[in-house]
Interface confidence: low
């Protein structure tokens, strides 16, 4: 019975040099054969000649010829077992077999590392018929070998549903060293040790490594790959690379820049995104990070008013999202704003200062010393007050809003009056007699209406009462001032 040996993927053997059954070449063609120019017996083993012992699969035909002579076993001829060549060279190798003419439809397929080679490969099968046998030569050529062409190649032939397998042909592609690990760019702290790694492979092995710093070799004695270089520390940026050498020559890795961490550059493009009476939203574009991630930023704010005491307010924030709302500012004020950011090394300089202004706001305090009294002769209530301090007006005063609430026998009615900004007194008509009038006043700017003053109450008697006295804003501590006349 015929057995089938499936070729498993396996590494090609590494030999130190040429040996019986191997061929070292950088040339094309290798073992090339004539193209249909006739039979060349010198390159063939005749089926009738005794062959060397063979490890490939053998098919023993059961069919006999007319003369009833048994047919010899079928097997691929021995050929070169190991081809060593350089990358990008061409190579051609073949399998040959002599098949009795009684067999029809024989096909040969090529396999590499256990997988059939289909399609894009250059394989040619040639037939050289004779009286009794046909010599079949299957050639396989690669015009420019790559490392990926390394491996074990075999031929397979199917006859009568049986499979014949050739000895393997090992292809070993040698070339310049190939990097499997190159040094990586790094950002390091000044005068602090760090490691760089370099690894390269052949074939051919061994691969030796030299390190290069700023175009000068670091080690005069090569190290076997892989190599780790320990740099005790740098004071300035340097470029490192490694050279990998083998018998074919040398390959140089990419040059990598080792940067020294430094303080960041100052932020740029500080912009005012919006401003309100008491806050300013700013954004900025971070400067160069000094090869170390930003940790946080500091917003420095000082009053631009030449009469201010020049003190600087500091607001700390995270480095992202380059946006900050500065709060608790005064209304209608000018500020100089600068931004500084830090990384693990330290703080950047402050950005160019920009000028920003807050808008008008509603006043933050109510009018002071509100006094209310009854002018019975004219049936009016007179109201007087003092305007709030300028600093707390938060804008240009445009007037006052007066709320007066009249309460009598369960009925309550609120009325609002507007007064121009120059006034500090107002007169309102008595709405209801025998009632309590509660007065509150708020200052008004274009930014809005401020808080109302504490309520001041006055009792308006029925017609005919004569005595009256003023009501006024209470001294601190009196919760609900009422003056009953």
């Amino acid at each position: 019975a015929i057995t089938e040996a499936r070729e498993e993927a396996k590494p090609y053997p590494l030999f130190p040099g040429p040996f019986p059954g191997s061929l070292q070449t950088d040339h094309t063609p290798l073992l090339s054969l004539p193209h249909a120019s006739g039979y060349q017996p010198a390159l063939m083993f005749s089926p009738t000649q005794p062959g060397r012992p063979h490890t490939g699969n053998v098919a023993i035909p059961q069919v006999t010829s007319v003369e009833s002579k048994p047919l010899p076993p079928l097997a691929f001829k021995h050929t070169v077992g190991h081809i060593i060549l350089s990358e990008h060279k061409g190579v051609k190798f073949n399998c040959s077999i002599s098949v009795p003419n009684i067999y029809q439809d024989t096909t040969i397929s090529w396999w590499k590392d256990g997988k059939e080679l289909l399609g894009a490969h250059h394989a040619i099968t040639q037939f050289y018929p004779d009286d009794e046998v046909t010599a079949i030569i299957a050639s396989f050529s690669i015009t420019s070998v790559q490392r990926s062409d390394n491996g074990s190649y075999i031929c397979k032939m199917k006859i009568n549903n049986e499979e014949i397998v050739s000895d393997p042909i090992y292809i070993e592609v040698q070339g310049l060293p190939h990097f499997t690990k190159q040094p990586e760019s790094m950002n390091v702290t000044r005068n602090t040790a760090f490691n760089l790694t370099c690894q390269a492979v052949g074939p051919p092995e061994p691969v030796n490594i030299f390190w290069v710093q700023n175009s000068s070799r670091v080690n005069e004695q090569p190290e076997k790959s892989p190599s780790v270089l320990t740099v005790p520390g740098l004071t300035e940026m340097a470029v490192f690379s490694c050279e990998a050498h083998n018998d074919k020559g040398l390959t140089v890795s990419k040059g990598v820049q080792i940067n020294i961490k430094a303080i960041p550059s100052p932020p740029t493009e500080v912009s005012i995104r919006n401003s309100t009476a008491h806050s300013i939203l700013i954004s900025w574009v971070p400067g160069f990070d000094g090869y170390s991630p930003f940790r946080n930023c500091s917003i420095q704010v000082k009053e631009a008013d030449p009469l201010s005491n020049g003190s600087v307010m500091i607001f700390n924030t995270s480095a992202l999202p380059h946006l900050y709302q500065i709060k608790q500012l005064q209304a209608l004020a000018n500020y100089s704003i600068g931004v500084s950011c830090m990384n693990e090394i330290g703080w950047s300089a402050v950005s160019p200062w920009i000028l920003a202004s807050t808008t008008e706001g509603a006043p933050s305090v109510a009018p002071l010393n509100v006094t209310v009294f009854l002018n019975e002769s004219s049936d009016n209530v007179d109201i007087r007050w003092m305007k709030p301090p300028t600093k707390q007006q938060d804008g240009e005063l445009v007037g006052y809003r007066i709320s007066h609430v009249w309460q009598s026998a369960g009925i309550s009615k609120e009325l609002l009056e507007e007064v121009g900004q120059n006034g500090s007194r107002a007169r309102i008509s008595v709405q209801v007699h025998n009632a309590t009038c509660t007065v509150r006043i708020a200052a008004v700017t274009r930014g809005g209406v401020g808080p109302f003053s504490d309520p001041v109450k006055i009792f308006i008697p029925a017609h005919g009462w004569v005595d009256y006295a003023p009501s006024s804003t209470p001294a601190p501590g009196n919760a609900d001032p009422v003056l009953i006349i």
């Epitope: 740029t268 493009e269 912009s271 919006n274 954004s283 380059h322």
Partner: antibody, heavy 118, light 107 residues
Framework: QVQLQQPGAELVVPGASVRLSCKAS????????MHWVKQRPGQGLEWIGE????????NYNQKFKDKSTLSLDKSSSTAYMQLSSLTSEDSAVYYC???????????WGQGTTLTVSS | QVVLTQSPAIMSASPGEKVTITCSAS?????MLWFQQKPGTSPKLWIY???NLASGVPARFSGSGSGTSYSLTISRLEAEDAATYYC??????????FGAGTKLELK
Amino acid sequence: QVQLQQPGAELVVPGASVRLSCKASGYTFINYWMHWVKQRPGQGLEWIGEIDPSDSYANYNQKFKDKSTLSLDKSSSTAYMQLSSLTSEDSAVYYCARCDYYGRLDYWGQGTTLTVSS
Amino acid sequence: QVVLTQSPAIMSASPGEKVTITCSASSSVSYMLWFQQKPGTSPKLWIYSTSNLASGVPARFSGSGSGTSYSLTISRLEAEDAATYYCQQRSSYPPITFGAGTKLELK
């Protein structure tokens, strides 16, 4: 992906008001200011104003302060611009545009063509 | 408010030519942005922070300038560059202001 969807066209009579919409998708609506820009036929771009969806704070170009009111609906990620007392001068394409952290108008709607005509 | 004046208002150039559009500010600004707009479409952010190209903008475009004088340059004009270009500032704001635009046509 970031998208700002605006109705293609609106036709209104002089003196009326109109509310233009801009529906945002593909990003966190409250994190980015929304701007509105006007472009009259064959003319350049004019900035109307901007609104911060996190707290509805708006800044206006003084020229459009009495004409436009910016608002939004966070639940539907939609920004609105109300234009009042319309005249033929208000006929234009109105764009909404998203503003990133650096103040760049990085995504724009397709624009709504407003025609004011009797 | 800062007024931006673009020049020229309209220009025509041949493919392969170098083209420069300028934008002059009435007072100093920190940086400039540029937008490209083609007929019937929305403006597209083209250059930001004076000289940085927005995503997808070809490398033949560049921006430069400082203070009150800024420019957009196309090193070798291509047919697809025909459009109107607007400069925009927001370092003095509000309001944000745009230039009146430069219409670039192909000869």
